[in-house]
């Protein structure tokens, strides 16, 4: 049977890395769906056996670790009672290049690099992208500039998956990397993410990325209704800031993991001349009393803006 093609993700990453990809297509994946991963052109699904190097773990496909032979196109097929959708991932696995001799001390010389920006004269933070299923335990984050490990001090302070950089100067740009230990079923793996950091003078009164909506505003919404709110973000092309919705300092998808009543949507983007306009929505399938007065915050790099739902004011006219 034919499935509707939703989109294709292009992913380039180094061999030897643990690699996850989560297949989500809200609101379809909020309800009862059958979700299966395939490697094309095979008609056999990826195994659910968690002891295999490549396996499906709930909505995720997990490579522990990647090999060069894993390059190819993977399809995630989402079926519910009425529809079928497929999301493709074009995976390119590169030779490992962590600080090898040909790189002149730089870990960042390939396409599998996150671009991030630090604001000159201010404090900024770098994100270590660590999104894995619950079956994976993550710890022992280390940060590197070039190939030298960064030690916590006045300049740098690690905090969870972030590296805070104080009083950013031009020379703080360059090649960074973060590594973390991943434990899965008693086996250990090392994750390494490479980050190319640019420093930028921040325009007075304006942050990069710039959240154009929401604006720390309230929205009147009736109890029990469905609501979709877009977060609109303008960012420079070379930046790879994380964009997400949070509540109570927790990712919305994690906070409402069990009920899936509130979900973050698929991110879309439009390329402008020297910027990209991103949109990521939040969907309230059914507004409850507990949602009123609670800030739902859109985050993009160092920028954040929230909405607060308020009960509609009665119209006495």
């Amino acid at each position: 049977d034919t499935c509707e093609d939703i989109f294709m993700h292009n992913v380039i990453i180094s061999e030897g890395q643990p690699f996850p990809f989560n297949c989500t297509y809200p609101p379809e994946t909020n309800g009862a769906v059958n979700l299966t991963w395939y490697k094309t052109p095979s008609k056999s699904p990826v195994s659910n056996n968690r002891h295999l190097r490549v396996h499906q773990d709930q909505t995720w496909i997990l490579f522990l670790p990647l090999t060069l032979e894993d390059s190819g196109i993977y399809q995630c097929v989402i079926r519910n009672a009425h529809n079928c959708y497929q999301i493709a991932v074009n995976l390119t696995v590169l030779k490992n290049h962590w600080c090898d001799s040909s790189m002149e001390g730089s870990p960042v010389n390939s396409p599998d690099v996150y671009q991030q920006i630090l604001p000159i004269g201010k404090s900024g933070s770098l994100n270590c992208h660590l999104y894995f299923p619950e079956s994976c335990a993550l710890d022992s984050i280390k940060w590197y500039k070039g190939c030298e490990e960064i030690k916590a001090g006045k300049k740098y302070s690690p905090s969870g998956a972030k590296l805070l950089v104080n009083n950013v100067a031009v020379e703080d740009g360059g090649s960074y990397a973060c590594s973390a230990r991943l434990t899965h079923l008693g086996r250990h793996f090392t994750i390494r993410n490479y980050i190319a950091v640019n420093t930028k003078e921040v325009e007075y009164g304006r942050r990069i990325p710039n959240i154009t909506y929401p604006k720390n505003n309230s929205i009147e919404v009736p109890l029990g209704s469905t609501l979709i709110v877009n977060c609109n973000i303008t960012d420079t092309k070379e930046n790879t800031n994380l964009r997400c919705w949070r509540v109570n300092n927790t990712l919305v998808d994690d906070y409402y993991k069990d009920s899936k009543r509130i979900q973050e949507g698929i991110e879309t983007n439009v390329s402008l001349r020297d910027q990209i306009r991103y949109t990521v929505n939040i969907t309230f399938l059914k507004v409850k009393m507990e949602d009123y007065g609670r800030p739902f915050t859109c985050h993009a790099g160092v920028s954040a803006a929230y909405i607060i739902l308020i009960y509609p004011v009665p119209d006495f006219r």
């Epitope: 270590c128 660590l130 619950e134 335990a137 993550l138 710890d139 022992s140 984050i141 690690p158 905090s159 969870g160 998956a161 590594s179 973390a180 230990r181 434990t183 008693g186 250990h188 090392t190 109570n248 300092n249 927790t250 990712l251 994690d254 993991k257 069990d258």
Partner: antibody
Framework: EVQLQQSGPELVKPGASVKMSCKAS????????MHWVKQSHGKSLEWIGF????????RYNQKFKGKATLTVNKSSSTAYMDLRSLTSEDSAVYYC?????????????WGQGTTLTVSS | DIVLTQSPASLAVSLGQRATISCKAS??????????MNWYQQKPGQPPKLLIY???NLESGIPARFSGSGSGTDFTLNIHPVEEEDAATYSC?????????FGGGAKLEIK
């Protein structure tokens, strides 16, 4: 100042259940896993498991699966441990302790402990 | 599960002298250049207190007379010079894999 404030001592009968709490303050609750550790009288420490308040994930020591259930209430920054089908073997001091998600793999702050006595 | 064996189970050390406590793991707790071994101090009626993490790193606020060393399966906690307030039970703990396990403890008495 970081504090983990645990609920008071419990005296329960065999076969009963108990729910103890650990209220966190002085830090961002969702940045740390909350672990639970058992210490029987005169014995060494035993790790029970942890709850990740950031993503709702739990991990248990196989020995305590079916015995302990870990939960949290994020809005009150409180972690809970339910112990069921209690026997005299469960009499012990139970500690909650935190570990920074992603970054560390050690327990830097501990609660004062909740003493559980199971006796008929 | 990784078993941690501490020795001696108890020791008495004179004020100002060195106390040495050993912890042996049933398998290596090293990964990627790091040792996943921590040390705690516990006094009667109190919770454990972190002293040393990752085998040799001194926790903030802990006096420099405490030091940790070792790798693989063999680890040591040293206290020098021993002070009156150091009378306590000292436990090692591995965070290499779950279930995280603790040693049986070593009780330090000051002579």
């Amino acid at each position: 100042e970081v504090q983990l404030q645990q609920s008071g001592p419990e005296l329960v009968k065999p076969g009963a259940s108990v729910k103890m709490s650990c209220k966190a303050s002085g830090y961002t609750f969702t940045d740390y896993n909350m672990h639970w550790v058992k210490q029987s009288h005169g014995k060494s420490l035993e790790w029970i498991g942890f709850f990740n308040p950031n993503n709702g994930g739990t991990r248990y020591n196989q020995k305590f699966k079916g015995k302990a259930t870990l939960t949290v209430n994020k809005s009150s920054s409180t972690a809970y441990m339910d112990l069921r089908s209690l026997t005299s073997e469960d009499s012990a001091v139970y500690y909650c302790t935190r570990q920074e998600i992603y970054y560390s793999n050690y327990f830097d702050y501990w609660g004062q402990g909740t003493t559980l006595t199971v006796s008929s | 599960d990784i078993v941690l064996t501490q020795s001696p189970a108890s020791l008495a050390v004179s004020l100002g002298q060195r106390a040495t406590i050993s912890c042996k793991a049933s398998q290596s707790v090293d990964y990627d250049g790091d040792s996943y071994m921590n040390w705690y101090q516990q006094k009667p009626g109190q919770p454990p207190k972190l002293l040393i993490y990752a085998a040799s790193n001194l926790e903030s606020g802990i006096p420099a007379r405490f030091s940790g060393s070792g790798s693989g399966t063999d680890f040591t906690l040293n206290i020098h010079p021993v002070e009156e307030e150091d009378a306590a039970t000292y436990s090692c703990q591995q965070s290499y894999e779950d279930p995280y396990t603790f040693g049986g403890g070593a009780k330090l008495e000051i002579k």
